[in-house]
């Protein structure tokens, strides 16, 4: 018995070949014997029942001259999942074909992190075919009758070309994801104190229409708690603001991409941040996570002192030095200082590795007499 | 031809009303953001509201609000601008204009002039 | 609300002119910035929106650049149509703010 393998609403060909490789007579007939169509000589296609009741049952006539009577079956249903038999030649050829219907779950169009599930149903009682989705970047996913992505992530989006096989035979189809997610999944601005703080929260996709609501939860590294710092309406990619703290007075840019204004780096709006975005008619959130470093580089006395307060890597290195001079002294803490340090301009650098993250410089006039 | 034509300026006295309409044509109205603009004799420009498009956000100049009511009627292609409590200062040419789908005001009207004086 | 400074208020200039007029945001405002003209007695014209692109219609010796806070309009070769006061306009947020106005007048 041959196997063919059709997805519901696409067309399958079903195979019937002559040995003596030209035309002749045939009959396609389901397996209760009811007559499907066929030829009986005159190299006319004949219909077994009314047009209607058969207008998706077809033949390729131009093949027939080669010993070919496939049946085709356009517009396949799941109950179109039968044995055919194929009669020619004083003999009957058995084709099984098998209907699989796709769903995803919850759709194709996802937000960035969630999962895919892809389900092949058919009512016949076939073993388990082999799924496999191919991505055009070469990810591969495989599954059997339940296919399964998880932790999508934006660039996973595009087309994928999904393989059915069973019994070595196989079907292809295929699908494009939609994963909506931003383009970075956190950032960290490093700032001078007073120095004016852009947040930027650009979308990794583009959407005429983007309807929504997000807000920004601000976790400052000396609060004990975090606290909402500004919520938004998203409408047709209009952004307004429905609420704001008054401290910090933040401002937010009405167009996207998403866009926050922090009138000074102070030491107490050092911290994290986590945006969330919540879309019209979708389940589930984007998430963005932004870091603020805050440095400050003071005199007091006889002490030249550099602090930095927010999440910072401990690999990062922090150093005074006098302008063209080696470092005085470099730490893998948040603060570091110089005792009577000598006249001259003085940086303060945060570093990582080579790469510096940022620079303050002060001016010593003489010991004890600073200028910034 | 994407056209604005603003009616309804005229002379009032302070503390009076009166109602501006801006009939557009040429664009599908409902789908773009309109705002009024002013200008005093001799002055620079000034926004003074907008109104996003079918959705009816409005955002108005703190020199303007809880007086002045921007709306629109999309059967109509009609915005206006409702101005009540009206001051000397409120003299000026009145501009309606459409923004693009940037949010940026692209095509101006002619203006009306508001007179306000006793 | 934003501040929005324009400078020169006044410039004098002759056809064929190279005109640069510079705009300050008070804050970082991306590149959310627009131009327009307007002659006396006559309604703005819309020049150039998203900082630098230029509206259709609009001669390209007109030109925009800048981002953050500092933008720029140049007038490449001036022409006697050109003669007109110009606008900077921020599209950041609301209020929306205009500049004060640069006149451009005929040498």
């Known amino acids: 018995k041959t196997l063919v393998l059709g997805k519901e609403g696409e067309s399958a060909e079903l195979p019937c070949e002559s040995s003596q490789k030209k035309i002749t007579v045939f009959t396609w007939k389901f397996s209760d014997q009811r007559k499907i169509l066929g030829q009986h000589g005159k190299g006319v296609l004949i219909r077994g029942g009314s047009p209607s009741q058969f207008d998706r049952f077809d033949s390729k006539k131009g093949a027939w001259e080669k010993g070919s009577f496939p049946l085709i079956i356009n517009k396949l249903k799941m109950e179109d999942s039968q044995t055919y038999i194929c009669e020619l030649e004083n003999r009957k050829e058995e084709v099984e074909l098998w209907v699989f219907k796709v769903t995803f779950s919850p759709g194709t169009s996802l937000l960035q992190g969630q999962s895919l599930t892809l389900t092949l149903d058919s009512n016949s009682k076939v073993s388990n075919p082999l799924t496999e989705c191919k991505h055009k970047k070469g990810k591969v996913v495989s599954g059997s009758k339940v296919l399964s992505m998880s932790n999508l992530r934006v660039q996973d989006s595009d087309f994928w070309n999904c393989t059915v096989t069973l019994d070595q035979k196989k079907n292809w189809f295929g699908m494009t994801l939609s994963v909506l997610g931003f383009q970075k999944a956190s950032s960290i601005v490093y700032k001078k104190e007073g120095e004016q703080v852009e947040f930027s929260f650009p979308l990794a996709f583009t959407v005429e229409k983007l309807t929504g609501s997000g807000e920004l939860w601000w976790q400052a590294e000396r609060a004990s708690s975090s606290k909402s710092w500004i919520t938004f309406d998203l409408k047709n990619k209009e952004v307004s603001v429905k609420r704001v703290t008054q401290d910090p007075k933040l401002q937010m840019g009405k167009k996207l991409p998403l866009h926050l204004t922090l009138p000074q780096a102070l030491p107490q709006y050092a911290g994290s941040g986590n945006l969330t975005l919540a879309l019209e008619a979708k389940t589930g959130k984007l998430h963005q996570e932004v870091n603020l470093v805050v440095m400050r580089a003071t005199q007091l006395q006889k002490n030249l002192t550099c602090e930095v307060w927010g999440p910072t890597s401990p690999k990062l290195m922090l150093s005074l030095k006098l302008e063209n001079k080696e470092a005085k002294v470099s730490k893998r803490e948040k603060a570091v200082w110089v005792l009577n340090p000598e006249a001259g301009m003085w940086q303060c650098l945060l570093s990582d590795g080579d790469k510096v993250k940022m620079d303050s410089r002060i001016q010593v006039l003489s010991r004890g007499v600073n200028q910034t | 031809e994407v056209q604005l034509l603003e009616s309804g300026g005229g002379l009032v006295q302070p503390g009076g009303s009166l109602r501006l309409s801006c009939a557009a044509s040429g664009f599908t109205f409902s789908t773009y953001a309109m705002s009024w603009v002013r200008q005093a004799p001799g002055k620079g420009l000034e926004w003074v509201s907008t109104?996003?498009?079918?959705?009816?956000?409005?955002y108005y100049a703190d020199s303007v609000k809880g007086r002045f009511t921007i709306s629109r009627d999309n059967s109509k292609n009609t915005l206006y601008l409702q101005m009540n409590s009206l001051r000397a200062e409120d003299t000026a040419v009145y501009y309606c204009?459409?923004?693009?789908?940037?949010?940026?005001?692209?095509?101006w009207g002619k203006g009306t002039t508001v007179t306000v004086s006793s | 609300a934003i501040q929005m400074t324009q400078s020169p208020s006044s410039l004098s200039a002759s056809v064929g002119d190279r005109v640069t007029i510079t705009c300050r945001a008070s804050q970082g405002i991306r590149n959310d910035l627009g131009w327009c003209q307007q002659k006396p007695g006559k309604a703005p014209k819309f020049l150039i929106y998203a900082a630098s692109t230029l509206q259709s219609g609009v001669p390209s010796r007109f030109s925009g650049s800048g981002y953050g806070t500092d933008f720029t309009l140049t007038i490449s070769s001036l022409q006697p149509e050109d003669f007109a006061t110009y606008y900077c306009?921020?599209?950041?947020?609301?209020?929306?703010?205009f500049g004060q106005g640069t006149k451009v007048e005929i040498k």
């Open positions: 109104i996003s498009d079918n959705i009816g956000n409005t």
């Open positions: 306009l921020q599209d950041y947020n609301y209020p929306r703010t």
């Open positions: 204009t459409k923004d693009n789908e940037d949010y940026y005001m692209d095509v």
